[in-house]
């Protein structure tokens, strides 16, 4: 249903508050270096213009597309060339090429200062002095650091952020009330950003079909009582929502997400019995709740899949004449029966099935050829099961920090060309799979672990894409979305790697390490560990453990010393010498 004025349509649908917030997010995700005040000015100008269009949809420029309006506005920024360099060339293009150009310049790792949390009293004063600006600043700071953050979900985070300050700034112990809430929002926010980044990568790098396959599998697990037509409708709508958000069409995305939540709640009887509580909540909470809702119970009386997809002599006829429906139905039926499998495993099985049919349906005796296709699934299922079992045992034995260290060593040996900060960040996140998933019973471990690992490895892929340094990373990241984790798992030590030259500066530490939080201190130590492995990739576990134990003792000793700086200087030299000797550097 075409509207005379798209901007008026979205303004009316979303309301002024959400409209302004979403435009701010969109602008901050495109122009990540622009000061807050500049963005606020641009947003206010767009909002005033939208109001004129609401008043009269035939007014001048009101018929222009949102991309045209927003792009024109972004291109008025005076310092575009100085701040963004070649991104300024986007402004010479016409839509839709101009928007595509802006999208290509989104930076997953922008050169922005780390967000330092002010004192609680300072934050509460700022919140009370100007609540609106305070909350806008939150949206701006998150959006510019996470240019693919799911915009309607960021509105939900902002609502919780506001609620935290509203409650805690009047509490007796403000810090005790506020800080845990902010920590939780930060951690959840990072996880949400990474999950959405994978969705966008899936759409942008592997296409709509790949995303739809992922969505069919996930929604079939979540809504196993919903019939195929219902799941297909939800998949189509969800794909539209995520395509819009990943494409920078945040107003349309938020509007369509709200429509989808409304549809799901109106039709919950034919979708899932678990939606009742979600559907009683206000819009932002409702959408979030639906996205996180637990899997419904599997319906009774599901017959074996073998009859229709293996034993039937008409498989090739059905496949040839209705390829997408047949494969979609296979994935749906398999996924709804297997909430215990990861989505990526289900997609591997579907791909194996498709490949087998492609081969067998051209064979002399197709039925004889595909009769054993389900047997091919066995090793594909056992591989992640065994890997998770081994790694959970290792996690339980070592604890999170040492488990992360084991992964740091493992991944540095696999891809030593990758930058140290990236290896530390990715390995730390990989290591979190232990505390996140190993506590679950067997039936929930694989979907938790392997789908989480897909999200983390996508972080590695997007960071590496910005500055590619390893052919092995490029290969694992680009060949197959669903085989990324098995591809990285299969990598052995990179024998072609020339060890990094030893640089004493890398291993020089100062007294400032003593005032760091436990997390920051761990990161320092883990950075040193990566560098050690880069210098000595053939070092054994035992050698590395000895050096790291010495290092921990050194930090502990010097942090207790009266003259910390002198201790770090003198003992540090000794440690470096001892480490070199121990590792044969």
């Amino acid at each position: 249903d075409a509207h005379k004025s798209e901007v008026a349509h979205r303004f009316k649908d979303l309301g002024e508050e959400n409209f302004k917030a979403l435009v701010l997010i969109a602008f901050a995700q495109y122009l990540q270096q622009c000061p807050f005040e500049d963005h606020v000015k641009l947003v206010n100008e767009v909002t005033e213009f939208a109001k004129t269009c609401v008043a009269d949809e035939s007014a001048e420029n009101c018929d222009k597309s949102l991309h045209t309006l927003f792009g024109d506005k972004l291109c008025t920024v005076a310092t575009l060339r100085e701040t963004y360099g070649e991104m300024a060339d986007c402004c010479a293009k016409q839509e839709p090429e101009r928007n595509e150009c802006f999208l290509q310049h989104k930076d997953d790792n922008p050169n922005l200062p780390r967000l330092v949390r002010p004192e609680v009293d300072v934050m509460c004063t700022a919140f009370h002095d100007n609540e609106e600006t305070f909350l806008k600043k939150y949206l701006y700071e998150i959006a510019r650091r996470h240019p693919y953050f799911y915009a309607p979900e960021l509105l939900f985070f902002a609502k919780r952020y506001k609620a935290a300050f509203t409650e805690c700034c009047q509490a007796a112990d403000k810090a005790a009330c506020l800080l845990p809430k902010l920590d939780e929002l930060r951690d959840e926010g990072k996880a949400s950003s990474a999950k959405q980044r994978l969705k966008c990568a899936s759409l942008q790098k592997f296409g709509e079909r790949a995303f739809k396959a992922w969505a069919v599998a996930r929604l079939s697990q979540r809504f196993p009582k919903a019939e195929f037509a219902e799941v297909s409708k939800l998949v189509t709508d969800l794909t539209k929502v995520h395509t819009e958000c990943c494409h920078g069409d945040l107003l349309e995305c938020a509007d369509d997400r709200a429509d989808l939540a409304k549809y799901i709640c109106e039709n919950q009887d034919s979708i899932s019995s678990k939606l009742k509580e979600c559907c009683e909540k206000p819009l932002l909470e409702k959408s979030h709740c639906i996205a996180e809702v637990e899997n419904d119970e599997m319906p009774a009386d599901l017959p074996s899949l073998a009859a229709d997809f293996v034993e039937s002599k008409d498989v090739c006829k059905n496949y040839a004449e209705a390829k997408d429906v047949f494969l979609g139905m296979f994935l749906y039926e398999y996924a709804r029966r297997h909430p215990d499998y990861s989505v990526v495993l289900l997609l591997r099985l579907a791909k194996t099935y498709e490949t087998t049919l492609e081969k067998c349906c051209a064979a002399a005796d197709p039925h004889e050829c595909y009769a054993k296709v389900f047997d091919e699934f066995k090793p594909l299922v056992e591989e992640p099961q065994n890997l998770i079992k081994q790694n959970c045992e290792l996690f339980e034995q070592l604890g999170e920090y040492k488990f992360q260290n084991a992964l740091l060593v493992r991944y540095t040996k696999k891809v030593p060309q990758v930058s140290t900060p990236t290896l530390v960040e990715v390995s730390r996140n990989l290591g979190k799979v232990g505390s996140k998933c190993c506590k679950h019973p067997e039936a929930k471990r694989m979907p938790c672990a392997e789908d989480y690992l897909s999200v983390v490895l996508n972080q590695l892929c997007v960071l590496h894409e910005k500055t590619p340094v390893s052919d092995r990373v490029t290969k694992c990241c680009t060949e197959s979305l669903v085989n990324r984790r098995p591809c990285f798992s299969a990598l052995e030590v990179d024998e072609t790697y020339v060890p990094k030259e030893f640089n004493a500066e890398t291993f020089t530490f100062h007294a400032d390490i003593c005032t760091l939080s436990e997390k920051e201190r761990q990161i320092k130590k883990q950075t040193a560990l990566v560098e050690l492995v880069k210098h000595k990739p053939k070092a054994t576990k035992e050698q590395l453990k000895a050096v790291m134990d010495d290092f921990a003792a050194f930090v502990e000793k010097c942090c207790k010393a009266d003259d910390k700086e002198t201790c770090f200087a003198e003992e540090g030299k000794k440690l470096v010498a001892a480490s070199q000797a121990a590792l044969g550097l």
Epitope: E227, A229, E230, D301, P303, A307, E311, E321, A322, V325
Partner: antibody
Amino acid sequence: EVQLVESGGGLVQPGGSLRLSCAASGFSLSSYAMNWVRQAPGKCLEWIGHINAGDIAYYATWAKGRFTISRDNSKNTVYLQMNSLRAEDTAVYFCARGAGGFSTGPFKLWGQGTLVTVSS
Amino acid sequence: FELTQSPSSLSASVGDRVTITCQASESINSRLAWYQQKPGQPPKLLIYDASDLTSGVPSRFSGSGSGTDFTLTISCLQPEDFATYYCQGYGGSSTTTFGCGTKLTVL
């Protein structure tokens, strides 16, 4: 409520044609293979054919040529077109839902049936 | 393929254990269903995939077999169980076949 309702049965002369309808409610026909089964008075169940989720129709050997199954997803209805009817086609005609989109069985959901009488 | 059901009729008393067999002319793996039909009603699914009991069906009904030979057993016959029972073979192709039924009557 999930149900199937057949209609269109009645008295027809030998050599005549009839189109039976099966209207589904409470679920979407397009998700399932939809079957037609008949039962002559006091006789066995006899499968006629089905149309699957890929819109591919399959028929019992004896039904090919005279019987055609189709569906209209927008009306959530499946049809059985019967031509050149004979006295031995007299039966109650049931519509039944397959377990999945490409299933030939089992049939958990059945309509109540519609009687077709072929007689001069 | 064809399905041969036996016996074609059977008389029994309440409390009896009753067995009906169904033989396929070729292997159909475990793709066999059993239905109960009462006069004027459509068939009702009791067992699918040879031995899986449909939800809501009493546990006195059980199915067994695979390949070509299948059995439906009613362990302790109840008054409401007197009806005609059909087997159905499916899955070997996109066609399906019914047996010709076993009429179970009161002795």
